[in-house]
């Protein structure tokens, strides 16, 4: 008797965060030998069977969750962890602050404000270098994103985006990039 | 216009076996995933069998795998069911489907049913 | 036993506005698969209803309509007419074997 199948993983190459019309390729990785891949779309009942799906041009109704599953025999994996696929640059930017200054003290406090003239409900932060959203528990984003205590490793280059919870796939293009300098 | 229509339904003992066939027209038939869905009489709609478009990719219901084996013949435009060790819970009509399908995307449903086949598994 | 549960019949008089409810699971529904419906007329095929929750195929009118939250979802209709006599079936897809799976179906009936 053989063990469960493991899990496949799913990536978007280069980035999970895509600017409209630009090119991305999802690739769904099991073990050797699988008989079949299949890749969802979630809340949208679409499926292809093919590992890798290539899209020459993103579009806003490409944005959304994603998920895939192999088949070996008759068994099928359990699904991998889901990818969301956002789709960037569908709204304006928004502008990226430092309070009191981007230049600070080893040791001082800081807060980055991501603002937007627009009525958006929801802001992701991204260090330039790191794969996720800064400070992200559970998807939770705000405005302002306080960093206590400052060390040299919060030195670098730091954009936002903002979103509307009701469609959290479509995002607007990156603020303009703001440099930390810890001194 | 679109059209499916299934035929070799009929009486059969059970421990028999019985071929099912689905005819298309009207669409680039090889392009689309298609089901065999089944209704025991006064019952609701059972999934059986579906089978993508090159025939490649197929999965079954547990009540009938390692019975039944679904293929297609898509130079025939043709789908099929072969049903052996037959049961007399098999009894329904069975009607093929299709899944409707977009660009590369297939979905989740079905867009047009053939009008079913009755087989009818009785001593 | 059905994977996805609906109540096995409703009832309305001419006019009036029905509901069919159809609960599903945290593997189908739940994991995020869209529900659609299919009405079933006396002696026929079924036919698709709705696709994608609420989305209504051509031809159909305007007076059925879906929608789906969570694990669950319904069907709607709106203005009850003798035609809209039929068994009416939900439908997903179940994220453990990869299958299609039914409810169980409604009998629709209208009164007088």
């Known amino acids: 008797q053989r063990g469960p199948l493991p899990k496949p993983s799913l990536q978007a190459l280069p980035s999970s965060l895509v600017p409209l019309e630009k090119p991305v390729t999802l690739r769904c990785q099991g073990p050797p030998g699988v008989d079949l891949y299949r890749l969802e779309k979630l809340s949208s009942s679409r499926y292809q069977d093919q590992a890798v799906l290539f899209i020459p041009a993103m579009k806003r109704h490409l944005a959304g969750r994603y998920r895939c599953s192999y088949q070996n025999g008759s068994l099928w994996s359990p699904p991998s962890d889901q990818l969301e696929l956002v789709a960037t640059g569908v709204f304006a930017k928004p502008s990226l602050s430092a309070q009191p200054g981007p230049a600070v003290s080893s040791g001082g406090d800081v807060t980055l404000q991501c603002q937007t003239r627009y009525g958006f409900d929801q802001f992701a932060l991204y260090k330039e270098g790191d794969p996720a959203p800064y400070k992200n528990p559970e998807r939770w984003y705000r405005a302002s994103f306080p960093i206590i205590t400052v060390t040299a490793a919060h030195s670098g280059t730091y954009r936002c985006y903002s979103f509307s919870s009701g469609d959290p796939y479509l995002w607007s293009a990156p603020s303009d990039p703001l440099e930390l300098m810890v001194t | 216009q679109v059209q499916l229509v299934e035929s070799g339904g009929g009486l059969v003992k059970p421990g028999g076996s019985l071929r099912l066939s689905c005819a298309a027209s009207g669409f680039s038939f090889g392009d689309y995933y298609v089901s065999w869905i089944r209704q025991a009489p006064g019952k609701g709609l059972e999934w059986v069998s579906a089978i993508g478009g090159s025939g490649s990719a197929v999965q079954y219901a547990e009540s009938v795998k390692g019975r039944f084996t679904i293929s297609r013949d898509n130079a025939k435009n043709s789908l099929y069911l072969q049903m052996n060790s037959l049961r007399a819970e098999d009894t329904a009509v069975y009607y093929c489907?299709?899944?409707?399908?977009?660009?590369?995307?297939?979905?989740?449903?079905?867009?047009?049913w053939g009008q079913g086949t009755l087989v009818t598994v009785s001593s | 036993q059905s994977v996805l549960t609906q109540p096995p019949s409703v009832s309305g008089a001419p006019g009036q506005r029905v509901t069919i409810s159809c609960t599903g699971s945290?593997?189908?529904?739940?994991?995020?698969?869209?529900v659609h419906w299919y009405q079933q007329l006396p002696g026929t095929a079924p036919k698709l209803l709705i696709y994608g929750n609420s989305n209504r195929p051509s031809g159909v009118p305007d007076r059925f309509s879906g929608s789906k939250s969570g694990t669950s979802a319904s069907l709607a209709i709106t203005g009850l007419q003798a035609e809209d006599e039929a068994d009416y079936y939900c439908?997903?897809?179940?994220?453990?074997?990869?299958?299609?799976?039914f409810g169980g179906g409604t009998k629709l009936t209208v009164l007088g």
């Open positions: 489907a299709r899944h409707y399908r977009e660009f590369r995307w297939h979905y989740y449903y079905f867009d047009y």
């Open positions: 439908q997903s897809h179940d994220l453990g074997a990869h299958v299609w799976v």
């Open positions: 945290s593997s189908n529904i739940g994991a995020g698969y869209d």
